[in-house]
């Protein structure tokens, strides 16, 4: 399956925080979305192969890495002034 952690996270002002996303489905593609209250999902970043990733629609204030196929961590940087949201990770073949 696919595992995202933590379930809840509090960020101190000026801090970077990292959300973990791990999958054991042998999927090449992985995605990070953000959902704000009353809104649809918006794509932050996506990765289609190891060590490559592209910006989605709202990449400002976020960073990612894809060091291995199974993992696609998202860092919410201190530059992201409005980080409060629901974050969703997904993967596909």
């Amino acid at each position: 399956g696919i595992t995202q952690s933590p379930k809840y996270l509090f960020r101190k002002e000026g801090q970077n925080v990292t959300l973990s996303c791990e999958q054991n489905l042998n999927h090449d593609a992985m995605y990070w979305y953000r959902q704000d209250p009353g809104q649809g999902l918006r794509l932050i970043y996506y990765s289609q192969i190891v060590n490559d990733f592209q910006k989605g629609d709202i990449a400002e204030g976020y960073s990612v890495s894809r060091e291995k196929k199974e993992s696609f961590p998202l860092t919410v940087t201190s530059a992201q002034k409005n980080p409060t949201a629901f974050y969703l990770c997904a993967s596909s073949i």
């Epitope: 192969i49 190891v50 060590n51 490559d52 894809r66 060091e67 291995k68």
Partner: antibody, heavy 120, light 112 residues
Framework: QVQLQESGPGLVKPSETLSLTCTVS?????????WNWIRQFPGKGLEWMGY???????NYNPSLKSRITISRDTSKNQFSLKLSSVTAADTAVYYC?????????????WGQGTTVTVSS | DIQMTQSPSSLSASVGDRVTITCRSS???????????LHWYQQKPGKAPKLLIY???NRFSGVPSRFSGSGSGTDFTLTISSLQPEDFATYYC?????????FGQGTKLEIK
Amino acid sequence: QVQLQESGPGLVKPSETLSLTCTVSGYSITSGYFWNWIRQFPGKGLEWMGYISYDGSNNYNPSLKSRITISRDTSKNQFSLKLSSVTAADTAVYYCASPSPGTGYAVDYWGQGTTVTVSS
Amino acid sequence: DIQMTQSPSSLSASVGDRVTITCRSSQSLVHSTGNTYLHWYQQKPGKAPKLLIYKVSNRFSGVPSRFSGSGSGTDFTLTISSLQPEDFATYYCSQSTHVPFTFGQGTKLEIK
């Protein structure tokens, strides 16, 4: 910052096996990425030889497939090249290398290179 | 294997000149993901190659803005807008779309 350093004999006899080791510092080779061997012939041409992945899987240049083995020693954070049945045509500068984060497979971490001469 | 053909093989130019090096691949370098894994390296004597441009047009960290890359499919160019003394070196294109990864034969840029 990832740093790579090749080591091994500079002279190998024809028909013998060339063995080189790359020691990686600043990053664990099991944490991610692909750990490559690339050689440069005296005429300056570059050839990708193959890699070992973070999970231990290999991908080799088919032109070398019957002669090449890339392995690793995770306890020492090293990966190694063995090339069997060498000839004078295998004389080259051998580099270990790994990709820079987020660039696809574009390599930007290189060892200093080690010159291997095949001669009796 | 994908053949990478660079032209010219050597080039003489002066400081301040605009220089273009071309690279042609024997097959399309568009990956199944839609990305194109064509890269440019600079090499100086006795040193390992250094990454300049990755994925056709992305300048690597610390690379001056006078270096730019363009192209698509099978035809690619590296342009140096205004040559500086430290730019005299050998330049290689490389593809990592298809295994085995391959390099061009190099373009040696010399001082006129």
